[in-house]
């Protein structure tokens, strides 16, 4: 049995633009510690889409359900989505450490962008 | 009924070392992770280990690390907590508790209580 | 390392009565919109027992006359009206980062 999941539930999610965008993660559990973060893309040239401690994301709300008995929720919002927002986002576990090291990512979530 | 009962405590001299055990029932003992808290009179309660459900993570406070290591067997629903190099102030009573996200503490057990004196 | 003040160190209540209990983490103690401060109830005797996760939610099995309330660094347990069966001490306790700490506990009595 994994020790943790990363599961992020919709394959993909349509949204008009000028509309925000709701990104749901869970993770199993909070061990081993360490961070959450947001990704669009993979590999070294991925963009930072929100990491809770660093760094500041105007546009991105967390929108976790804290009543939610059995997983942590780590889900956002991305408000007024642009078409340059189109893209596969990645919620990933980090183990804490000197630096972050990744450890798990969900399977990503394809975000398309309609127009008005 | 989910039920975790600690043993292994009892009187050990400075210096010297414990093993407790706490046996789990009533619960997917491999799909948590699982903690010591000991509670003192004077300190009140205190973190002591935390590891992960598959056992390959283990986290302690600096209050305790490298004397005590923190071990699962998930074939036996069985969660170890070896003490080493035990002083004084390690004198309390042991708490074998569960965690579903590793996060709040869902159960306790009843406690085994250590203590340390010469 | 999170240090928590719990106050008052202990609380005479009639019955009937509104019972509050805080506490103050020295930082923050959120994460995506989680506030991870948790309450617990102990009797003589007895383990603790988890009464409220992540701030404001109730276990299953706890009596809705406790809620929890707070976010960031303050925090309350609230206990109405209070019940001859509520005489316990009750304690904070954060998970928001490593060391995990408590609070040094409230003892509630009746007046």
């Known amino acids: 049995e994994e020790e943790l999941q990363v599961i992020q539930p919709e394959k993909s999610v349509s949204v008009a633009a000028g509309e925000s965008a709701t990104l749901n993660c869970t993770a199993t559990s909070l061990i081993p510690v360490g961070p959450i973060q947001w990704f669009r893309g993979v590999g070294p040239g991925r963009e930072l889409i929100y990491h809770q401690k660093e760094g500041h994301f105007p546009r991105v709300t967390p929108v976790s359900d804290p009543t939610k008995r059995n997983n942590m929720d780590f889900s956002i919002r991305i408000s007024n989505i642009t078409p340059a927002d189109a893209g596969t986002y990645y919620c990933v576990k980090f183990r804490k450490g000197s630096p972050d090291v990744e450890l798990k990512s969900g399977a990503g979530t394809e975000l398309s962008v309609r127009a008005k | 009924e989910v039920q975790l009962v600690e043993s292994g405590g009892g009187l050990v001299k400075p210096g010297g070392s414990l093993r407790l055990s706490c046996a789990a029932s009533?619960?997917?003992?491999?799909?948590?992770?699982m903690s010591w808290v000991r509670q003192t009179p004077g300190k009140g309660l205190e973190w002591v280990a935390t590891?992960?459900?598959?056992?390959?993570?283990?986290y302690y406070p600096d209050s305790v690390k490298g004397r005590f290591t923190l071990s699962r067997d998930n074939a036996k629903n069985s969660l170890y907590l070896q003490m080493n190099s035990l002083r004084a102030e390690d004198t309390a009573v042991y708490y074998c508790a569960s965690q579903l996200t590793g996060s709040e503490f869902d159960y306790w057990g009843q406690g085994t209580t250590v203590t340390v004196s010469s | 390392d999170i240090v928590i003040t719990q106050s008052p160190a202990s609380l005479a209540v009639s019955l009937g009565e509104r019972a509050t209990i805080s506490c103050r983490a020295s930082e923050s103690v959120d994460s995506y919109g989680n506030s991870f401060m948790h309450w617990y109830q102990q009797k003589p005797g007895q383990p603790p027992k988890l009464l409220i996760y992540r701030a404001s939610n109730l276990e299953s099995g706890v009596p809705d006359r406790f809620s929890g309330s707070g976010s960031r660094t303050d925090f309350t347990l609230t206990i109405n009206p209070l019940q001859a069966e509520d005489v316990a001490t009750y304690y904070c306790h954060q998970s928001g980062d490593l060391p995990w700490t408590f609070g040094g506990g409230t003892k509630v009595e009746i007046k």
């Open positions: 009533g619960f997917t003992f491999s799909s948590y992770v």
């Open positions: 590891i992960s459900s598959g056992g390959t993570y283990t």
